[in-house]
Interface confidence: medium
């Protein structure tokens, strides 16, 4: 590239900003498009209109959108069609000086393919590299009076369509994802169509979490949540793990002979056994239950720790309704309602002379339940959470796995019966019996608890094994896909989620190291600056206007404070 | 260069009228909003009034508002401030300005003397 | 009407000293809708208009020399010349651009030692 044009990349020099320009027509390359542009530098573009004037028909107040134009050379801050540093009129408000924003003409020149657009297609964008006058005069070139970018050449045909378009984005098919994404991020078309995007390509969007409102409240809830965000958090973290570990493996040992408690784990599945173990003492844990047992301490401490971190998190935490639907807090309170319940009947067992409180199915229902704490590792494992979030996202392709496996089941159970129905060495008494040889086989476990006999059920038997190695393949390679994605989603640095704080809220980034409390220092452009007055009354017409951080949108109209939005992915800790 | 040659100051009287003009170059004035801001010798800056690039909203400040008229003609890049019943607190240089509620660029101003 | 108070009304300094020149407003200058200070710096050399040097409080216009830099929000604000050059002498403004009518302070004089 020549070394005028790269000279582009910097801001002009003051004097060079507003040299005028009589109209003229560059050479055109190739097949490049033309310019037939008046074109005279501008002043700075205007800031939009203070959050005081509104706009009414007929009264004489200055609309929002209306500032003060200008910006770089060929163009102007289109002051009457809201091309200005100020922000556009939300669409209920039609900018009253629409006609007047900027019918001439302009070029854009591509690493040497020219783009021709009216500048009012730009002005509908006024947030954005193009849309901007001030952000896009460093890319122009006087001489040449065009605009000019390195940049990829196929997606700025997309690029362009955004504008033309009124804000639809396409990707190229010739453009990869990732060069797309970039030319989206370089052209500041915000994060709207930077999700527009991601969701058309199949990315799942990110919600955002508020934090707790009060300071105290906040530190405890950021404490029990984020372990990254601190030591003592990663303390707790730690803790918790550990204690579900204990918890878990406490679950496994008082299952082996020499501790079983012979009440819940009966020897024999004699009638008698099952009578006599509702006063048993025998075995080896006589008086398993009772409350001086080791197993029963270590749970109770078990316990302990998860009710306190349970309750603690939801009394610090900022929506309770939000918290009860989490179905993370769900696996907790299922975690621990075995252990009460237990309890209860324990305690209920003493006071009724030793009678059984309740029916050892149902207790042994219920402390199995037990078991489902290990899931409460996934709140601090990323591979648990990537598993969690790959079956979220193939619930389709799984329906479909048990769909295609429920009509084999039918299909060879019935054909495996009927072809071995006339031997009578033969295991399948009946369809259903047969059941569970098909899912079996067509899983291609093959036990063999179970198998025919006759040629034609052994040949009933290989197609049901061919079908279920193809049927089964079928929707695997979806899921492997969402699988990828939600790892490389992690690895790749994603996992760096914003705390946010929104309008006022100050911007709390979080890395994989800590959360660090920073102020916010987006850019602001001119083109914010935006009020209404009406009559001697000053009020807002627009709505909270969301900041945009990372690949995700944060909204907290609620309250003011520091801090009071976070990004809903956590940081884990690596497992 | 973006240019703002203001005219049409003078001495009057008080109760008189004056009409200002600003011609601008450099830039596409007809999409650019405009201002009047004046300066009195040793005192504070003072906005006076505003108005959109189509010309058809404008704003002004209370201590003038219903004496001054601000318009603007896109054709001949000019803006205009039609100030009548002029009392001697108007003195002061006024300069023609982009912007409406941050101005990117000034005009040198035209002196306006009101005294009898 | 919002009020703005400017202080001090002149400061001398040395060239390459800090100096910071504060601006108060009668009530908070920060738009509801987007959470941004409505506020504006302007310097005025001798025999010469004013410039824009910085808006919403904090943002460069274009074309400003890195060592003006402003900050503040709600009320209070702040111009900061980090390191006076000679060509600084002149009289800072500050403006609110939140509500008509647009009010300016009274100035403060920067003089070069």
């Known amino acids: 590239m020549d070394e005028r044009l790269s000279l582009l990349r910097s801001p002009p020099p003051p004097s060079a900003r507003h040299r005028a320009h009589p109209p003229q027509r560059p050479a055109s390359s190739g097949g490049a498009h033309t310019l037939v542009n008046h074109g005279y530098a501008e002043p700075a573009a205007g800031r939009e209109l203070p959050p005081d004037m509104t706009v009414v028909p007929g009264d004489h107040l200055l609309e929002p959108e209306v500032a003060d134009g200008g910006g770089a050379p060929p163009q102007g801050g289109c002051g009457g069609g809201g091309c200005d540093r100020y922000e556009p009129l939300p669409p209920s408000l039609p900018a009253a000086g629409e006609q007047d924003c900027c019918g001439e003409r302009v070029v854009i020149n591509i690493s040497g393919l020219r783009f021709e657009t009216q500048l009012k297609t730009l002005c509908q964008f006024p947030e954005t590299l193009l849309g901007d006058p001030k952000r896009r005069m460093r890319y122009f070139d006087p001489l040449r009076n065009e605009y000019f970018f390195d940049r990829n050449r196929p997606s700025f045909d997309a690029i362009l369509y955004y504008y033309q378009s009124g804000g639809r984005i396409r990707r190229p098919v010739n453009v990869p994802i990732d060069i797309f994404s970039e030319e989206i991020r370089f052209y500041q078309l915000g994060e709207e169509a930077m999700e527009k995007f991601r969701e058309d390509e199949g990315f799942l969007r990110e919600e955002e979490r508020p934090l707790p409102r009060r300071d105290f409240q906040r530190q405890v809830w950021l404490l029990f949540e984020y372990p990254e965000s601190s030591g003592p958090a990663r303390g707790i973290a730690i803790v918790s793990v550990l204690v579900i570990l204990i918890s878990i493996v406490i679950f496994c040992l008082e299952t082996l002979p020499e501790f079983r408690d012979e009440k819940d784990y009966p020897a024999s599945t004699s009638q008698d056994s099952f009578e006599a173990a509702g006063n048993s003492t025998s075995g080896s844990r006589a008086g398993a239950s009772s409350f001086s047992d080791p197993f029963f301490v270590v749970e109770t401490l078990c316990i302990i720790w998860f009710s306190f971190e349970l309750l603690v998190r939801f009394f610090a935490c900022p929506s309770k309704a939000t918290f009860s639907r989490n179905i993370m807090n769900l696996i907790d309170i299922v975690a621990i309602i075995p252990y009460f319940i237990t309890l209860g009947t324990e305690l209920a067992e003493r006071q009724g002379n030793g009678q059984q409180a309740m029916s050892l199915a149902i207790l042994r229902v219920i402390r199995l339940v037990r078991v489902f704490r290990i899931f409460k590792l996934s709140r601090h494992s990323k591979g648990l959470q990537i598993l969690g979030q790959t079956l979220k996202a193939s619930m389709r392709e799984l329906g479909l796995l048990i769909f295609f496996l429920f009509i084999g089941v039918i299909l060879f159970s019935s054909a495996v019966y009927f072809a071995e129905a006339d031997d009578p060495t033969s295991g399948f008494s009946s369809i259903p019996d047969a059941f569970w040889w098909a899912v079996v086989t067509m899983t291609t476990v093959g036990y063999g608890d179970m198998h025919p006999v006759t040629i034609g059920g052994k040949i009933v038997g290989s197609l049901c094994a061919i079908a279920g190695v193809l049927t089964i393949a079928l929707p695997v390679p979806v899921i492997v896909s969402n699988f990828n994605y939600f790892y490389h989603r992690e690895t790749e640095g994603e996992e760096q989620s914003q705390y946010m704080h929104v309008g006022s809220c100050q911007h709390l980034s979080s890395s994989a190291e800590e959360l660090r409390k920073a102020r916010s220092n987006s850019t602001l452009s001119k083109s914010e600056y935006m009020v209404i007055e009406e009559g001697g009354m000053n009020h807002s017409a627009f709505p909270q206007t969301p900041f945009k951080t990372g690949n995700s949108t944060a909204t907290c109209t609620t309250n003011n404070n520091p801090n009071s939005c976070v990004n809903i992915k956590k940081i884990f800790t690596d497992v | 260069q973006v240019q703002l040659q203001e005219s049409g100051g003078g001495l009057v009287q008080p109760g008189g009228s004056l009409r200002l003009s600003c011609a601008a170059s450099?830039?596409?004035?007809?999409?650019?909003?405009m201002s009047w801001v004046r300066q009195a010798p040793g005192k504070e800056v003072e906005w006076v009034s505003s108005?959109?690039?189509?010309?058809?909203?404008?704003n002004y400040r209370d201590s003038v508002k219903g004496r001054f008229t601000i318009s603007r003609d896109n054709v001949k890049n000019t803006l205009y401030l039609q100030m009548n019943s002029l009392k001697p607190e108007d003195t002061a240089f006024y300069h023609c300005?982009?912007?409406?509620?941050?101005?990117?660029?000034w005009g040198q101003g035209t002196q306006v003397t009101v005294s009898s | 009407d919002i009020q703005m108070t400017q202080s001090p009304s002149s400061v001398t300094a040395s060239v390459g000293e800090k100096v910071t020149i504060n601006c108060k407003s009668s009530?908070?200058?920060?738009?509801?809708?987007?959470?941004?200070?409505?506020l504006n710096w302007y310097q005025q050399r001798p025999g010469q208009s004013p410039r824009l040097l910085i808006y919403y409080a904090s943002t460069q216009e274009l074309g400003i020399p890195d060592r003006f830099s402003g900050s503040g929000s709600t009320t209070d604000f702040t111009l900061t010349i980090s390191s006076v050059q000679p060509e600084d002498a002149a009289v800072y403004y500050c403006?609110?651009?939140?509500?008509?009518?647009?009010?300016f302070g009274s100035g403060t004089r920067l003089e070069i030692k």
């Open positions: 009530q908070s200058v920060v738009s509801a809708s987007n959470q941004k200070s409505y």
């Open positions: 450099g830039f596409t004035f007809s999409i650019n909003g």
């Open positions: 108005i959109n690039s189509g010309g058809e909203i404008t």
């Open positions: 300005v982009t912007g409406i509620v941050a101005y990117d660029y």
């Open positions: 403006q609110q651009a939140y509500s008509a009518p647009y009010n």
